[in-house]
Interface confidence: medium
C-alpha cells in the first residue's frame, strides 16, 4: 500500500510481488519524487484499491503500456 508522507507526497516502501491482471487495472501514476525512497508505480484497480509496483519489472511496464494505449489510441 502507498503511504502519504504529507498531503502532497505519496511514497511506496514495498512493492507487490504478485502480477496483477491488466483487466483488473483502471489507471496508474508514477512516483518519482526525490522525497521517496524509491521510484514506483501506483496502480489503481477497478475496485479503487491502490497497489505499489516496481517500474523496472516488465509486467508493470506492460500494464502501464496497455493502460496508456487504451486511453491514447482513438477508439474506432
Amino acid at each position: 500500500q502507498p503511504d502519504a508522507i504529507n498531503a502532497a507526497v505519496t511514497c511506496c516502501y514495498n512493492f507487490t510481488n504478485r502480477k496483477i491482471s491488466v483487466q483488473r487495472l483502471a489507471s496508474y501514476r508514477r512516483i518519482t519524487s526525490s522525497k521517496c525512497p524509491k521510484e514506483a508505480v501506483i496502480f489503481k484497480t477497478i475496485v479503487a484499491k491502490e497497489i505499489c509496483a516496481d517500474p523496472k519489472q516488465k509486467w508493470v511496464q506492460d500494464s502501464m503500456d496497455h493502460l496508456d494505449k487504451q486511453t491514447q489510441t482513438p477508439k474506432t
Partner: antibody, heavy 117, light 107 residues
C-alpha cells in the same frame, strides 16, 4: 549496479554467421527485456529486436526477421544475438541493452563485428 | 515503422550556450520518446525518457519537451563534457526507431 558485458570483437566472412553474447549482472534478466541495437561505422543507431527471457518471446524489426536469432539463458543471465548470412553492410558495433518499455537504460560496451572477405 | 527526423544533423556551439535539438515523428508518439548522448567509442547513455523524466544522475541542464509529433532536447548551458552526438528514439511502437543524430561540436 547493473552491468552488461559483451563478448569480444569478431571478423567474419560474407555468408557466415556471428553470435554475440551479453552477460548481465546486478539484475534478474527474467524480470526485464533484453534488446539488441547496432551501429554501422559513422552511422546512427538501429534497433534489431528484443527477447523476453522469461518465456523466450521475441520481437524483431522486420528488416532482420529470418536472419537474426535472439536467445537467453536465465541460469547464466546471458542474452545472445546471432546474425546469419552476413554481408559487408552488417559491419557494425552491436550493443545489448536492458529495455524499460522500449527505451534502454543500461547498455553493454558493444561488440565490433567486421564482415570482410 | 515510425520515422524520426532529427535536426540539425550537426551544430557548433560554445561553452555556456543554450542548445536546442529537435526531433519530429511521422505520427503521434504520445510522449513515448527518449534522448541519448553518445561519445566516440562509447555506448549511448540515456538522458531523458517519456514526457520529461530525467534519468538518475543526469544534470538538470538537460531537459525535454514536446508532444504529439514534435519533441525538443534543450541543454540550458553547454558544458565541455556535453560535446557529443545526441539521438532521439520513439518507443510508442516496435520497431523502435532512432533519429539520425545531432553532433554537437565546439565552435
Amino acid at each position: 549496479q547493473v552491468q552488461l558485458v559483451q563478448s569480444g570483437a569478431e571478423v567474419k566472412k560474407p555468408g557466415s554467421s556471428v553470435k554475440v553474447s551479453c552477460k548481465a549482472s546486478g539484475l534478474t534478466i527474467s524480470h526485464t527485456y533484453m534488446h539488441w541495437v547496432r551501429q554501422a561505422p559513422g552511422q546512427g543507431l538501429e534497433w534489431m529486436g528484443r527477447i523476453d527471457p522469461d518465456n523466450h518471446n521475441t520481437k524483431f524489426d522486420p528488416k532482420f526477421q529470418g536472419r537474426v536469432t535472439i536467445t537467453a539463458d536465465t541460469s547464466t543471465s546471458t542474452a545472445y544475438m546471432e546474425l546469419s548470412s552476413l554481408r559487408s553492410e552488417d559491419t557494425a558495433v552491436y550493443y545489448c541493452a536492458r529495455g524499460v518499455f522500449g527505451f534502454f537504460d543500461h547498455w553493454g560496451q558493444g561488440t565490433t563485428v567486421t564482415v570482410s572477405s | 515503422d515510425i520515422q524520426m527526423t532529427q535536426s540539425p544533423s550537426s551544430l557548433s556551439a560554445s561553452v555556456g550556450d543554450r542548445v536546442t535539438i529537435t526531433c519530429k515523428a511521422f505520427e503521434d508518439i504520445y510522449n513515448r520518446r527518449a534522448w541519448y548522448q553518445q561519445k566516440p567509442g562509447k555506448a549511448p547513455k540515456l538522458l531523458i525518457h517519456g514526457a520529461t523524466s530525467l534519468e538518475h544522475g543526469v544534470p538538470s541542464r538537460f531537459s525535454g519537451s514536446g508532444s504529439g509529433t514534435d519533441y525538443t532536447l534543450t541543454i540550458s548551458s553547454l558544458q565541455p563534457e556535453d560535446f557529443a552526438t545526441y539521438y532521439c528514439q520513439q518507443f510508442w511502437s516496435a520497431p523502435y526507431t532512432f533519429g539520425g543524430g545531432t553532433k554537437v561540436e565546439i565552435k
